[in-house]
Interface confidence: medium
């Protein structure tokens, strides 16, 4: 059985400040089921940016269809980027328990951010 | 309908503790980061502390860094605030707000705790 | 640091007539500024965010303008309800969170 692969192809990001952001993450396989979650940062001090299962991420969107069957792609856009959303954000595949469990991280994305041009 | 319900509030003297809890219905609690902001008599708004939606991350005013604990229960769906070696510059109302997003303003408030420290 | 200076300190407006806020940041916030009202008493309240957007249940005679360092408050055909302590409060840079000193609207 193929270990599941969790895919961030950009190692880094920059954006001005006002600007959207996307930060790309597929999987490579749809096994074993269970949901992705975006966090800023690593470690217990990490932020929770986008979790399609609940909460409210009203500056998120998912780029392709989250809910769609087979969907292998959790791409997510940030809009109206500013300096404190800089960081390192990592797409991170769980496994469908109670409650889910973490499996796979991906190796990251680093989001700098521009001062807007004048 | 969102709310949050602070307690623990009181009377204590200078050097003492006491812990606020911050009660949170009517959303998705572990999804958002939480923070308390306080209020002293007949003055403006001053943000003290804030936690992300994990627990494992916390920001602090510099004026209680070191003597306070914002921590979290999301099982509970509770936030506290732990706050040691209290002064008289503490006396405020503590109200317990919710973050729209990890990056951004307060949309819900609490009511407000009162919190007198007095010799 | 960002600094959050608003004005007046006091606004003494008639019913019905239009009471203008001011908040001005020591460095450009972009458009991550809210403003939240404060009754006699009671908790704050969330009006406007982003700028310009108005929170769920807010009365369309509040609207915000403004980006980069200077913002306003409008509250127009003021309601004796609308007596209230104002702060502006910026998300732009943190920690810490910054919320200017506030503008307290009276009725006349």
């Known amino acids: 059985e193929e270990e599941l692969q969790v895919i961030q192809p950009e190692k880094s990001v920059s954006v001005a400040a006002g600007d959207s952001a996307t930060l790309n993450c597929t999987v490579s396989s749809l096994i074993p089921v269970g949901p992705i979650q975006w966090f800023r940062g690593a470690g217990p001090g990490r932020e929770l940016i986008y979790n399609l299962k609940e909460g409210h991420f009203p500056r998120v969107t998912a780029v392709s269809d989250p809910t769609k069957r087979n969907n292998m792609d959790f791409s997510i856009r940030i809009s109206n980027i500013t300096p404190a959303d800089a960081g390192t954000y990592y797409c991170v595949k769980f496994r469908k328990g109670s409650p889910d469990v973490e499996l796979k991280s991906g190796a990251g994305t680093e989001l700098s951010v521009r001062a807007k041009p004048s | 309908d969102v709310q949050l319900v602070e307690s623990g509030g009181g009377v204590v003297r200078p050097g003492e503790s006491l812990r606020l809890s911050c009660a949170a219905s009517g959303f998705s609690f572990s999804s958002y980061a939480m923070n308390w902001v306080r209020q002293a008599p007949g003055e403006g708004l001053e943000w003290v502390s804030r936690?992300?939606?994990?627990?494992?991350?916390?920001d602090y005013a510099e004026s209680v860094k070191g003597r306070f604990t914002i921590s979290r229960d999301n099982s509970e769906n509770t936030l506290y605030l732990q706050m040691n070696s209290l002064r008289a510059e503490d006396t405020a109302v503590y109200y317990c707000a919710k973050q729209y997003d990890w990056n951004g303003f307060f949309d819900y408030w609490g009511l407000g705790a009162l919190v007198t420290v007095s010799s | 640091e960002t600094v959050l200076t608003q004005s007046p300190a006091t606004l003494s407006v008639s019913p019905g007539e239009r009471a203008t806020l001011s908040c001005r940041a020591s460095q450009t916030v972009g458009s991550k500024l809210a403003w939240h009202q404060q009754k006699p008493g009671q908790a704050p309240r969330l009006l406007i965010y982003?700028?310009?957007n108005r929170a769920t249940g807010i009365p369309d005679r509040f609207s915000g303008s403004g980006s980069g360092t200077d913002f306003t408050l409008t509250i127009s055909g003021l309601q004796t309800e609308d007596s209230a302590v104002y702060y502006c409060?910026?998300?732009?840079?943190?920690?810490?969170?910054?919320f200017g000193g506030g503008t307290k609207v009276e009725i006349k």
């Open positions: 409060q910026q998300y732009y840079y943190w920690p810490p969170y910054r």
């Open positions: 982003d700028a310009t």
């Open positions: 936690i992300n939606s994990g627990g494992g991350g916390t």
